[in-house]
Interface confidence: medium
């Protein structure tokens, strides 16, 4: 009669995390009798992961085929897999001893791949708001995926940007990995309503990838221009200069009007117009009483936009 | 002989807050000798429901005598059920062994889904009161609602409204879910007696949906009209002058009479006209001794409403 | 009602033995494992072993293989705890309990020469 | 053999005080098979929490259970006269079975 053989038919399983994997595994013979062992790796360190005669092993399950009283098959099924169970797994029989059962023969092995989706990509952008023409980074994160390779692309608004670093870590094997991109964003005036995407694509996505944005207006400072201008009246001794404060992100925007220097009044902006851009307009106007001053007067509009340096603009007005 | 098979006959069972669920096993065969356990989920952090010869199960009950000698039915009902409870629950064979018993077959499992009610609607408006043809935002919350399908409507005076956007969170597989709404409604001048109401249909109602309202009253505030009138007096030296105050909401209202800019006095609305649509009307008065001024009199009737900036409507009283 | 009812006190010599019984009411041995714990004077609880009267098949704690043996008798519905060889160590108070939930009065044995 | 560790082995609590007992296995226990024993003197054990967390029929609320792998734990929210006794913790999850060996709570 021949020896038993110990049959492993999968050289290798690749299992999606949080399925069951099916490792499969027969003996030839009923002889010698003995128990079957399943091992996670070879050697002294190797991992019990399912003993046919003792211990407890709750996601291990015999696979539940309609067999006959002389089962030859010891294939199991191991429930919830997650990255960390990849590795190569033994079938072994063990023959009958005393005191302990000894080692008879073990399958040549099976091993075990686990394909672990990315996590979500999020993309975060600078702490503080930059102005246009100057350069930001966004960076993307996502993590616990499995196998290694990965593609990661940067868009602007659809367009796909060169400007970026990537790193996938760690550099050696390891049950999942973390990928962490850096990308160099040229800021423009129109912006605000500019968006910058991170695009992941990986083998368990099944072609469909996935996307973290993240809105430039979130991290842009579009300066204000300003106008001063001096509008008709119909009465003599007034005069209506107007201060229209154009094109500016984000609202955030205090006013002050000045004679000769000295303020006369100081407004916040509330109702703006939004233009198509994103960007934002305002108007204010000064009536000043033309009989109050002898001389020419100077006024200027100086304005503090979300919280940096005020900026200004002056008009003389002559005093006919 | 054939190996026994562990049949579990229903892929899922749905089963309403607080009611009792059966879960159905039955075994094809009484060999191998061994205990019959039930557990929630799969793998190592599998949950154990119900341990046939031993242990304490108090919410479950067996719904045979597990102690007839050939039986077969291991069905198991598990009292008053929550959300908490919902899963997928295996019948598992063991089979005697040393020195722990061995797991022998698993049923394929039976779905338990949970059907919970959403939690009566909460309406919530804007912490500020805002005026007419502005838009303010209101809230609608619900808990507890199982399974995650859920459809919400928003309605104003029973005309149902467009403009909101719906969440249901989480996004992912979850006990239980929360529902978050918020609708945009534009005011118009008669929203005081409105109402917005939060309707939501769920598979546990029944067709009958929970509505939730809120009143537009709490978040309206309509500025009042003001009208500056003479009127008749017999007597010679004295003026009645009224301020008709029309058409406001909330009640909040304070109103000085200034003479030549000077405050002559002060009064806070108590007795209001309700008009059909809400609002309130009032009128205040003031009795002007002619013979106290050489010079016409401008008169000048100043309301405060809710807090907010004084508007005024002023008159000239000739003194002839 | 579940109920589990353990033979009266017993006073032994050393080196004799002594079978304890527990019989069940209100439910059927045969359903459940019966299990031993030994408890000496203000001391705590020991696992001696537990059997499966469906089949008699037993299992024991290290400590009392050879000391212990633990038998059932599904017709009478009782489960015995039979102590060989006693000694004063052997003084304590033996619980029978079913499945780890509903537990007896408990029997005192006295080894005492 | 888990060797079940439990500690204080005595402590006294006043009425009103937050009591935690503490039960460490030398190696992981499964959380189904974590079973708390109340016992007073003259007395059965008698089944207090079961499966790590859950409170046996008649069991006061403010009774809680908690904890995985080696270490979990028996907490009193509000201590009660009526909970002077000693406490065993109790593994099923392998053979041979163990207790700990016990806390003896007294009211201060």
């Known amino acids: 009669e021949d020896e038993l053989q110990v049959i492993q038919p999968e050289k290798s399983v690749s299992v999606a995390a949080g399925e069951s994997a099916t490792l499969r595994c027969a003996m030839t013979s009923l002889i010698p009798v003995g128990p079957i062992m399943w091992f996670r790796g070879a050697g002294a360190g190797r991992e019990l992961i399912y003993n046919q005669k003792e211990g407890h092993f709750p996601r291990v399950t015999t696979v539940s085929e309609l067999t006959k009283r002389n089962n030859l098959d010891f294939s199991i099924s191991i429930s919830n897999i997650t990255p960390a169970d990849a590795g190569t797994y033994y079938c072994v029989k063990f023959r009958k001893g005393s005191p302990d059962d000894v080692e008879f023969k073990s399958g040549a092995g099976t091993e075990l791949s686990v394909r672990a989706k990315p996590s979500a990509p999020v993309v975060s952008g600078p702490a503080v708001r930059a102005t246009p023409e100057h350069t930001v980074s966004f960076t993307c994160e996502s993590h616990g995926f499995s196998p290694r390779d990965i593609t990661l692309k940067w868009f602007k608004n659809g367009n796909e940007l060169s400007d970026f670093q990537t790193n996938v870590d760690p550099a050696g094997d390891s049950v999942s990995y973390s990928i962490h991109s850096t990308a160099r964003v040229v800021l423009t005036r129109g912006d605000v309503h500019s968006q910058v995407i991170c695009e992941i694509a990986h083998i368990t996505l099944q072609g469909d990838p996935l996307r973290g944005t993240a809105n430039l207006s979130e991290a842009i400072r579009v300066p204000p221009t300003l106008e001063v201008t001096q509008q008709p009246m119909r009465a003599e001794n007034q005069a209506n200069v107007t201060c229209q404060v154009s094109n500016f992100y984000p609202r955030g925007l205090q006013l002050t009007w000045l004679e000769n220097g000295n303020v006369s009044r100081t407004e916040t902006a509330s109702t703006l117009i939004e233009n198509k851009d994103g960007t934002y307009n305002w108007m204010s106007w000064l009536l000043v009483n033309t009989c109050a001053h002898r001389d020419d007067v100077v006024l200027t509009c100086q304005v503090e936009h979300d919280g940096q340096q005020a900026v200004s603009k002056s008009y003389a007005l002559e005093i006919s | 002989e054939d190996e026994l098979q562990v049949i579990q006959p229903e892929k899922s069972v749905s089963v309403a807050a607080g009611e009792s669920a059966t879960l159905r096993c039955a075994m094809t065969s009484l060999i191998p000798v061994g205990p019959i356990m039930w557990f929630r989920g799969a793998g190592a952090g599998r949950e154990l429901i119900y341990n046939q010869k031993e242990g304490h199960f108090p919410r479950v009950t067996t719904v045979s005598e597990l102690t007839k000698r050939n039986n077969l039915d291991f069905s198991i009902s598990i009292s008053n059920i929550t959300p908490a409870d919902a899963g997928t629950y295996y019948c598992v064979k063991f089979r005697k062994g040393s020195p722990d018993d061995v797991e022998f077959k698993s049923g394929a499992g039976t779905e338990l889904s949970v059907r919970a009610k959403p939690s009566a609607p909460v309406v919530s408006g804007p912490a500020v009161r805002a005026t007419p043809e502005h838009t303010v935002s209101f809230t609608c919350e619900s808990h507890g609602f199982s399974p995650r399908d859920i459809t919400l409507k928003w309605f104003k005076n029973g005309n149902e409204l467009s403009d909101f956007q719906t969440n249901v969170d989480p996004a992912g597989d979850s006990v239980s879910y929360s529902i978050h709404s918020t609708a945009r409604v534009v005011l118009t001048r008669g929203d005081v007696h409105s109402q917005v109401i939060c309707e939501i249909a769920h598979i546990t109602l029944q067709g009958d949906p929970l509505r939730g309202t809120a009143n537009l009253s709490e978040a309206i505030r309509v500025p009042p009209t003001l009208e500056v009138t003479q009127q008749p007096m017999r007597a010679e030296n004295q003026a009645n002058v009224t301020c008709q105050v029309s058409n406001f909401y909330p009640r909040g209202l304070q109103l000085t009479w200034l003479e030549n800019g000077n405050v002559s006095r002060t009064e806070t609305a108590s007795t209001l006209i309700e008009n059909k649509d809400g609002t309130y009307n009032w009128m205040s008065w003031l009795l002007v001794n002619t013979c106290a001024h050489r010079d016409d009199v401008v008169l000048t009737c100043q309301v405060e409403h809710d807090g907010q900036q004084a508007v005024s409507k002023s008159y000239a009283l000739e003194i002839s | 009602e579940v109920q589990l009812q353990q033979s009266g006190a017993e006073l032994v010599k050393p080196g004799a033995s002594v079978k304890l019984s527990c019989t069940a009411s209100?439910?059927?041995?045969?359903?459940?494992?019966m299990h031993w714990v030994k408890q000496r004077t203000e001391q705590g609880l020991e696992w001696i072993g537990r059997?499966?009267?469906?089949?008699?098949?037993?299992k024991y704690a290290p400590k009392f293989q050879g000391k212990a043996t633990i038998t059932a008798d599904t017709s009478s519905n009782t489960a015995y705890l039979q102590l060989s060889s006693l000694t004063s160590e052997d003084t304590a108070v033996y619980y029978c309990?079913?499945?780890?939930?509903?537990w007896g009065q408990g029997t005192l044995v006295t080894v005492s020469a | 053999q888990i060797v079940l560790t439990q500690s204080p082995a005595i402590m006294s609590a006043s009425p009103g005080e937050k009591v935690t007992l503490t039960c460490s296995a030398s190696?992981?226990?499964?959380?189904?098979?974590l079973y708390w024993y109340q016992q007073k003197p003259g007395s059965s054990p008698k089944l207090w929490i079961y499966?790590?967390?859950n409170l046996a029929s008649g069991v006061p609320a403010r009774f809680s259970g908690s904890g995985s792998g080696t270490s979990y734990s028996l907490t009193i929210s509000s201590m009660e006269a009526e909970d002077a006794a000693s406490y065993f913790c109790?593994?099923?999850?392998?053979?041979?079975?163990?207790f700990g060996g016990g806390t003896k709570l007294e009211i201060k």
């Open positions: 309990d079913r499945g780890l939930a509903y």
């Open positions: 209100g439910f059927n041995i045969k359903d459940y494992y």
């Open positions: 059997i499966d009267p469906e089949d008699g098949e037993t």
């Open positions: 190696s992981s226990v499964s959380s189904s098979y």
């Open positions: 499966s790590t967390s």
């Open positions: 109790h593994q099923w999850s392998s053979y041979p079975y163990t």
